[in-house]
């Protein structure tokens, strides 16, 4: 059964069905995903029957015997097995299945086997954090404060306002407040808010592939908590980064270079920060945020170390009462410790039980919040440090990083160049753009201590080879060594082509496989503007008129008539601030009408042709879907 004999409508349904089963989004259905599908669908079937059906589907569907079902094989299953019991059960399972959670993971208290389980502890922690964060926001009075002991949270996120606000607290200025619908909400304006929240979450690097507006509207607990955790974590980690917090250099160890320290993730830096203070207190180090902190002793000493000593003007001393250390009962000791944390204004995220159970997620959040409030680090006067090497990432680098993370690459990319030095993330991105990777050729970690870099270099060579031969990228003068060493210009050249191809692939899928290039996008933009009787047009993605954002705003209004409030815009003789104001509105409005835009307002103002292209391409995708 060739794709050609499937109608467009049926193809859309099949794609949707396939995406429901392919929960990890890698383009293939595995045995486990089939198993999970039947569990999640809650069909009245005994375990052995589920196993039989799954095995049957794998046996008949996996035509090339690679242990997984591709989309083409999936089409054949649907057509070839229409009448059988197995196929009927399979279809029923897909139809019954609600959004399977593919975020993060379950917490320590929940389990793999239960699809809809969620952590009460997380809910309690997040509600208290959000209540505190939004307590003075007039737009949230209708839901704040939420009761942490009820399902308030899952109802509160349903209109999108709280999510938008939390995203802006984590990464300020992500969402233009003017675009949030706040009054007299209707199902349509709620949908817009949820689009805005989800697309903005994606733009700050949240992995939201398997979360839809419906899931949030319905308040599906595991999806809501998964998204909130990502948003909260991004906010907590924002300053745990060397270029934004130079005092972290105090954590440099003997014989270590600044470069080594810069490669550490926020989690690793936090652990190192805690151990730096524990060492100063003459205590044992901790190796994790779970079992090693269960007795609260490390926390006691950490609080004592970071508490203000009264040597800073306007910051009164806080003397930590250490008597609770003598408590025999773990829970009691944890409670006493948290009372001391409260005196620092840092009793957040964990209860005494969370400490004693060693809940890693919530303990990480507790420590991150403590770090943000009381880092207690001093920038060393050591002259050997090359401060020039501390420059932060560029906007473009951050956009690329957020794009990768939003696609769910593993592990998360914290530092663009060092985290790509073994090419593993690049291989995952190739898979996302439908370039097949032979994983047998890839060296996988853990890498040996001796010759480890050689293994990484081999990966990088293969990544460049795939780019040239399979993806047909223009990679003249780029070798594996450039990726391995983190050559900025050459690494960015490859990443840009990956992002461009990803964007064009989405457009081509919507357009039924028709090839797309820059000229086609520009023509579509102008044609759409003309049909909507808009006066603006663009000659290319370098057109200076784009700096006003008016072509983008007009296009949004053409795609969704009446969506743009032109009273908020400056249209003539714009100065830089006015251009930025228009651009902020344009980017948020694009996300609000459903376009997954990663570009930043500054990209429009500066007419960065690469990012401008992605904006128009995403809008074109949105416009074509509407037709």
């Amino acid at each position: 059964m060739a794709r050609g004999s499937v109608s467009d409508e049926e193809m859309m349904e099949l794609r949707e069905a396939f995406a429901k089963v392919d929960t990890d989004g890698n383009g293939y259905i595995s045995f486990n995903e089939l198993n999970d599908l039947f569990k999640a669908a809650c069909l009245p079937l005994p375990g052995y029957r589920v196993r039989e059906i799954t095995e049957n589907l794998m046996a008949t569907g996996d035509l090339d015997q690679d242990g997984r079902i591709s989309f083409d094989e999936f089409i054949k299953i649907f057509h070839g097995l229409k009448s059988t019991d197995v196929a009927k059960t399979f279809r029923k399972a897909i139809n019954k299945k609600e959004g399977i959670c593919a975020i993060g993971g379950t917490s320590e208290q929940s389990s793999v086997g239960t699809q809809h389980s969620y952590s009460e502890e997380e809910k309690y922690a997040f509600v208290n954090w959000i209540n505190k964060a939004l307590e003075n926001d007039p737009d949230c009075r209708h839901v704040i404060p939420m009761n942490p002991n009820t399902n308030d949270l899952f109802n509160a996120v349903g209109d999108g306002i709280v999510l938008c606000k939390m995203i802006n607290l984590s990464v300020p200025d992500t969402i233009d407040e003017r675009t949030i619908n706040k009054k007299k909400l209707t199902p349509f304006t709620i949908q817009e808010n949820l689009n805005l929240a989800l697309n903005s979450a994606s733009a700050i690097g949240c992995h939201v592939v398997n979360i839809g507006a419906e899931d949030l509207k319905e308040g599906k607990p595991y999806l809501v908590l998964g998204l909130l955790w990502q948003v909260i974590k991004i906010g907590l980690f924002a300053d745990i980064e060397l270029s934004r917090n130079e005092a972290l250099i105090a954590l440099l160890r003997e014989g270590e270079s600044l470069e080594d320290l810069m490669k550490l993730s926020p989690e690793e830096l936090l652990l190192r920060w805690a151990n730096y203070h524990l060492e100063n207190a003459g205590c044992n180090k901790i190796g994790n945020f779970s079992t090693d902190i269960k007795d609260s002793k490390a926390y006691y000493h950490l609080l004592e170390q970071v508490a203000p000593k009264g040597d800073e003007e306007g910051v009164p001393a806080v003397v930590i009462d250490m008597s609770g250390l003598r408590e025999k009962d773990d829970i009691q000791r944890a409670e006493c410790m948290l009372q001391q944390a409260e005196r620092l204004g840092c009793r957040q995220f964990v209860t005494a039980t969370d400490v004693v159970r060693g809940n890693p997620k919530l303990n990480l959040a507790f420590i991150a919040n403590l770090f943000n409030r009381y880092p207690a680090l001093h920038k060393p006067e050591n002259q050997d440090i090359d401060w020039g090497a501390l420059e932060g990432e560029t906007r473009e680098e951050r956009t690329f990083r957020n794009w990768m993370n939003s696609l769910g690459v593993n592990p998360r990319v914290n530092h663009l160049y060092s985290d790509l030095s073994d090419a593993l993330v690049i291989f995952q991105l190739y898979e996302k753009i439908k370039v097949p990777v032979d994983w047998n050729r890839v060296n996988k970690p853990p890498y040996p201590k001796l010759g480890g870099n050689m293994k990484k270099l081999e990966n990088c060579n293969y990544a460049v080879e795939l780019g040239k031969n399979q993806a047909k990228f223009s990679l003249v003068g780029i070798g594996g060594q450039d990726l391995n060493e983190g050559n900025r210009t050459l690494t960015l050249a490859l990443i840009w082509q990956l992002m461009r191809r990803y964007t064009l692939n989405i457009l081509e899928e919507i357009g039924g496989g028709q090839k797309v290039n820059d000229d086609i996008i520009v023509n579509w933009v102008n044609e759409t503007l003309r049909e909507a009787k808009k006066s603006s047009s663009i000659s290319s993605f370098k057109d200076p008129k784009i700096s006003t954002s008016l072509p983008v705003l007009d296009l949004i209004d053409a795609i969704q008539p009446g969506s743009i409030n032109y009273d908020l815009l400056k249209t003539e003789n714009l100065n830089d601030d006015e251009k930025l104001n228009n651009a902020k509105y344009a980017i948020s409005m694009a996300r609000k009408i459903g376009a997954r835009v990663y570009a930043l307002p500054e990209d429009l103002v500066e007419v960065n042709p690469k990012m401008v292209m992605t904006v128009f391409a995403c809008l074109m995708g949105k416009g074509m879907k509407r037709v």
Partner: nanobody
Framework: QVQLQESGGGLVQAGSSLRLSCAVS????????VGWFRRAPGKEREFVAA????????YYADSVKGRFTISRDNNKHTVDLRMNSLKPEDSAVYFC?????????????????WGQGTQVTVSS
């Protein structure tokens, strides 16, 4: 050559505890997820627990939830599985394995490197 080495197995009475440890020799765990699996005689390999590279996201099989705790120490490059309230049905050879992508932590087929295993026997 990188090798995973499990330790801590043994023969214990039902209701007691054990702590298994997985160490990497010749390399460092770095940013890889680590899972524990077990195989009882005549049975299929079964997922037990897993932890992502940072130790923050943990996963458990229903059968061990609340009794077993997985944690990792990235300074020592070890991943521990603390097993409490052991039952005779927990008897098996326990293996640790690494998976850098960690998209499907419960799926043994996704894991890249495996240890030799350590025997756990729980008598009633």
């Amino acid at each position: 050559q990188v090798q995973l080495q499990e330790s801590g197995g043994g023969l214990v009475q039902a209701g007691s505890s054990l702590r298994l440890s997985c160490a990497v020799s010749g390399g460092t765990f770095g940013r890889v997820g680590v899972g524990w699996f077990r195989r009882a005689p005549g049975k299929e390999r079964e997922f037990v627990a897993a932890v992502n590279w940072s130790g923050i996201d943990t996963y458990y099989a229903d059968s061990v939830k609340g009794r077993f705790t997985i944690s990792r120490d990235n300074n020592k490059h070890t991943v521990d599985l603390r097993m409490n309230s052991l039952k005779p049905e927990d008897s098996a050879v326990y293996f640790c394995a690494t998976d850098f992508r960690f998209n499907a932590p419960m799926n043994g087929a996704e894991y890249d490197y495996w240890g030799q295993g350590t025997q756990v026997t729980v008598s009633s």
